[in-house]
């Protein structure tokens, strides 16, 4: 049941009125409107779309809608000097060149300003050398190459397949291995689902399709030239040599037709096992270099992209709260796309647009939410979450005092199988309760709840009869709010069947083929999954903004803290001798978790029983709930990652997309057996245990009775 209570201004409006106003047909119309031309960050087209959204949000009835601009470092290919990779013979002649562009889809042949595939922020360069195939270029892949196979990547160009981990981590790993360049490609094993046709006849990646994307390792910094501060008119900017997170070697992405031509000639060592082989008809030899007849041929990269400070624009809409206007619930998603953005981001932006329209309709009828709702259309997400991060840096003091929750709204779909939710444990119960009230759009679940279909298709690995909710990682605009500022955050979208579809992301991700037609023909012809996602995202925002008592359950944090403590303890216990030698104990952490559990339980009882009509008491209890996420922030941040400050969760150091629990301890323990100075290494483990213990205990104490 909705925990919302109508404000005293308009008793007739509740969440049902808001949800009933959401229409699939409108989302479809908005998606079509947003996807007719490219909206690359920093371009005139994306500025015009920002102004259009500003104008429409005003029409929909928001109190105010402003554009906020920042001047950030972006990266573009050189229009007159295209990027490509060649195979050169012993005379230096180019005997094969990779494609300069993706063949445009039917109907889009005359669209201008389609940016060719490139790796954003790649430095310029023309490295030349032998190729080494490095599988997914994960940490463990380089361990296998260097430690087991004794293959040295120093001075080599590496070719890695996309998938499994964020591309920036692949590039970082290649750099550390001494590579002089990186070629990224989409292997059909990861981006071609069996039995489905290539676009335009299906949703699979054609051989000429290429995934664009940034290759930064920002670790939450935002604009590389202004870490920690907004990139405004008076900002001090670092020189390029001191910029945060830029790769130091040239990088370029290609499709599988081009990859075939490079990989079919590979010689050297055979691949170590089947997990290194994709679906191309090539040997998947590791190298280095080409086989027999072709051993004198080399690979050469030609990269001429430039990085330039460019203006970007966020759209920020405000719907003022009637009772607690100084408490902010934020719904944000990005607007910039690599090309047409059929899924990423416009399937999300269209949903936000319809949510704004529905809230605006209620407001025009006299209703207001209890708390202020902020709506955001972020720019330059694709270039490193820049728009959201700069805005949060500019408004950090307000956000850390007033931010109740952030709901992310990038792509609404990455499949059409079931719901996928990642969020803070504080929101688990909100999500469960909401999905029990919503109707499932899935075939075979007519008349059943979304909770039921979600639980059936994506069961929790720990709790029977409940659906899976995952940890927040990064790679999207919630990062600054959650990982840096400690604002409770969540995201929801429709996803694929992870059991049967092993490919990473969806096949046409960040390609020119991510069009309106892709969504309308293959993913969601009736836009029923989009509507469901709008109901989930919008419903969460409604509850967070309108519930008298914030819909957070601190007991769910207690449960996961115990689970994460067990997990990290078990990792450490793989080294029992060292733990004994260096007196490593997790007792303090388990004690803090126990304290947190007890205090959270008592807090929940008080929350249930207190006098809700006492505004001071109500505000006090709500503040304790709001500030609980904030209590997990360590102002000093994680080692070497100052903008990742959440002690319980951080993006994995090996994959930005994945969340890691107790990341400080986890990283201290990672590969500890290979550390040169074990005493120092185990000392760092102990230090991280103490930081985690202190933080959990301190957070628990924020839930204690105030006096």
């Amino acid at each position: 049941k909705s925990s919302s209570e109508a404000t005293n201004i308009t008793p007739k409006h509740n969440m049902k009125a808001f949800l009933d106003e959401l229409k699939a047909e409108n989302i479809k119309k908005f998606l079509h409107n947003f996807t007719q031309i490219p909206h690359l960050a920093g371009t005139e087209q994306n500025f015009q779309l920002a102004k259009q959204i500003q104008s429409q949000w005003k029409e929909f009835g928001l109190d105010s809608v402003e554009l906020t601009h920042y001047d950030v470092l972006l990266s573009y290919p050189n229009k007159t000097h295209p990027n490509y990779i060649s195979i050169i013979n012993e005379d230096g002649n180019e005997i094969f060149n990779t494609s300069l562009f993706e063949p445009p889809p039917a109907g889009y042949e005359n669209v201008s300003d389609i940016v060719p595939p490139f790796s954003a922020f790649s430095p310029q360069g023309m490295p030349e050398g032998d190729l080494v195939y490095v599988n997914y270029a994960r940490t463990e892949d380089f361990f296998k190459l260097e430690r087991d196979m004794k293959i040295n990547c120093s001075g080599k160009i590496v070719i890695a397949r996309y998938g499994k981990v964020f591309r920036g981590n692949k590039v970082k790993n290649a750099q550390l291995a001494g590579a002089t360049g990186v070629i990224l490609y989409s292997d059909p094993a990861d981006y071609f689902a069996p039995g489905v046709k290539s676009y335009p006849d299906g949703w699979n990646l054609p051989g000429g399709g290429v995934q664009r994307g940034n290759i930064l390792n920002l670790n939450g910094a935002g604009d590389p030239l202004t870490p920690g501060y907004p990139a405004n008119e008076y900002a001090y900017r670092r020189g390029m040599a001191e910029a945060v997170g830029l790769p130091s070697i040239p990088v370029h992405p290609i499709g599988y037709y081009d990859a075939q031509k490079l990989l079919e000639k590979m010689g050297g060592s055979a691949s170590p096992d089947s997990s290194w082989r994709g679906s191309l008809k090539v040997p998947y030899n590791v190298g280095p270099g080409f086989t027999g007849n072709f051993s004198t041929q080399k690979v050469k990269m030609h990269i001429h992209s430039t990085s330039e400070v460019t203006r970007i624009y966020n759209v920020i809409g405000t719907l003022r709260g009637a009772v607690e206007p100084d408490r902010y619930v934020i719904l944000g998603g990005h607007r910039d796309s690599w090309v047409f953005g059929g899924i990423d981001p416009q399937s999300g932006a269209a949903v936000v647009h319809e949510i704004v329209r529905s809230f605006g309709t209620l407001k025009k009828e006299g209703w207001r939410p209890r708390r202020t709702i902020l709506f955001a259309s972020w720019d330059a997400e694709e270039f490193g979450l820049l728009g959201s991060t700069e805005w949060a840096e500019e408004n950090s003091r307000l956000l850390q005092e007033r931010g109740v929750a952030y709901i992310n709204a990038d792509s609404s779909i990455e499949g059409n199988y079931t719901l996928r939710v990642d969020c803070t444990p504080l929101m688990y119960s909100l999500v469960y309760n909401l999905t029990k009230e919503l109707e499932s759009p899935d075939e075979g679940f007519e008349g059943k709840s979304l909770y039921e279909s979600w639980t059936k298709k994506s069961p929790s690995p720990e709790f029977s009869g409940m659906p899976r909710i995952s940890k927040l990682g990064s790679g999207n605009d919630f990062e600054v709010f959650f990982q840096r500022l400690g604002i409770a955050s969540g995201r929801a979208r429709y996803t694929k069947n992870w059991e049967t579809n092993k490919f990473s992301s969806y096949p046409l991700y960040h390609s020119v083929y991510e069009t309106y037609e892709l969504v309308e023909k293959f993913y969601d012809p009736m836009f029923k999954y989009h509507l469901t996602v709008a109901q989930v995202r919008g419903g969460m925002v409604f509850e967070l903004a309108n519930s008298v008592v914030l819909p957070f359950d601190c007991r769910d944090y207690a449960v996961v803290l115990r689970k994460y403590a067990d997990k990290i303890y078990n990792i450490s216990m793989k080294h029992p001798q060292e733990m004994k030698t260096y007196s490593v104990s997790f007792d303090s952490l388990f004690s803090a978790v126990k304290n947190f559990t007890e205090i959270a339980s008592k807090f929940s009882e008080r929350l249930r029983d207190f006098d809700k009509s006492n505004p001071i008491l109500l505000r006090m209890m709500n503040d304790q709930l709001m500030f609980l996420e904030r209590a997990f922030i360590d102002p000093l941040g994680l080692p070497d990652r100052p903008f990742y400050r959440h002690v319980i969760y951080a993006p994995s150091s090996h994959n930005k997309y994945a969340g890691e629990s107790f990341p400080g301890i986890y990283d201290a323990l990672f590969d500890i057996e290979s550390k040169v100075d074990p005493s120092q290494a185990w000392g760092e483990v102990k230090r991280q245990i103490s930081v985690a213990t202190f933080t959990v205990q301190a957070a628990a104490e924020t839930l204690s009775e105030v006096a």
């Epitope: 195979i87 005997i95 094969f96 494609s99 063949p103 059909p188 071609f192 051989g207 000429g208 599988y256 037709y257 081009d258 075939q260 031509k261 691949s271 089947s274 082989r277 994709g278 679906s279 191309l280 008809k281 090539v282 040997p283 998947y284 072709f294």
Partner: antibody
């Protein structure tokens, strides 16, 4: 749509050479190898060899080394086969066929065939 | 080279009946990537061969669903569930896991 258009029938004398062409259209020429095959009357298909338009790399069936030479002209998207020192045994229909890339890896598009008759 | 042996050489059928053609390879056709590159073609009189089935069991675009392929390792089968007049001709199996080779062909004709 993908098309492979082969040159017309040839009548050649024993010991002579002949050059057949295969003009490709409707796809990106450099991505797909071109195979050449021989079919003698009432017999099966024999693979002669293949050429990669991307880099000009060739592969030959051992039985046809010295008999067939494969070349390409990227500018006109045309593949050629030169057959030398012809004998009556070489009388056959010669096909060019595009080597399908992933997911097919089969000869997914064929020319109409060129009939070569070796006779004095 | 890999030898592909087809049987029968000739297959007389009644229209509407099922037809089954076998193709046996002299060695395994499983590629190191795990896929099996065994394909089926139909050649009608005076025409070039047309691809029907690729990688054992996948129908090429435009091929009716009465055609199906199966098998693994060295033994493969093409089935036509209800033979129609337009299906008559010579069927070849072919492999591209190694240097390409073709079976000798099976002539499907009316009984």
């Amino acid at each position: 749509q993908v098309q492979l258009q082969q040159s017309g029938a040839e009548l050649v004398e024993p010991g002579a050479s002949v050059k057949l062409s295969c003009k490709a259209s409707g796809y990106t020429f450099t991505y797909f190898d071109i195979n050449w095959l021989r079919q003698r009357p009432e017999q099966g298909l024999e693979w002669i060899g293949g050429i990669s338009p991307g880099d000009g790399n060739t592969n030959y069936n051992e039985n046809f080394k010295g008999k067939a030479t494969l070349t390409i002209d990227k500018s006109s998207t045309t593949a050629y086969i030169q057959l030398s020192r012809l004998t009556s045994e070489d009388s056959a229909v010669y096909f060019c066929a595009r080597d399908g890339n992933f997911p097919y890896y089969a000869m997914d598009s064929w020319g109409q065939g060129t009939s070569v008759t070796v006779s004095s | 080279d890999i030898e592909l042996t087809q049987s029968p050489l000739s297959l007389p059928v009644i229209l509407g009946d099922q037809a089954s053609i076998s193709c046996r390879s002299s060695q395994s056709l499983v590629h190191s990537n795990g896929n099996t590159y065994l394909h089926w073609f139909l050649q009608k009189p005076g025409q070039s061969p047309k691809l029907l089935i690729y990688t054992v069991s996948n129908r090429f675009s435009g091929v009716p669903d009465r055609f199906s392929g199966s098998g693994s390792g060295t033994d493969f089968t093409l089935k036509i569930s209800r033979v129609e007049a337009e299906d008559l001709g010579v069927y070849f199996c072919s492999q591209s896991t190694h240097v390409p080779t073709f079976g000798g062909g099976t002539k499907l004709e009316i009984k």
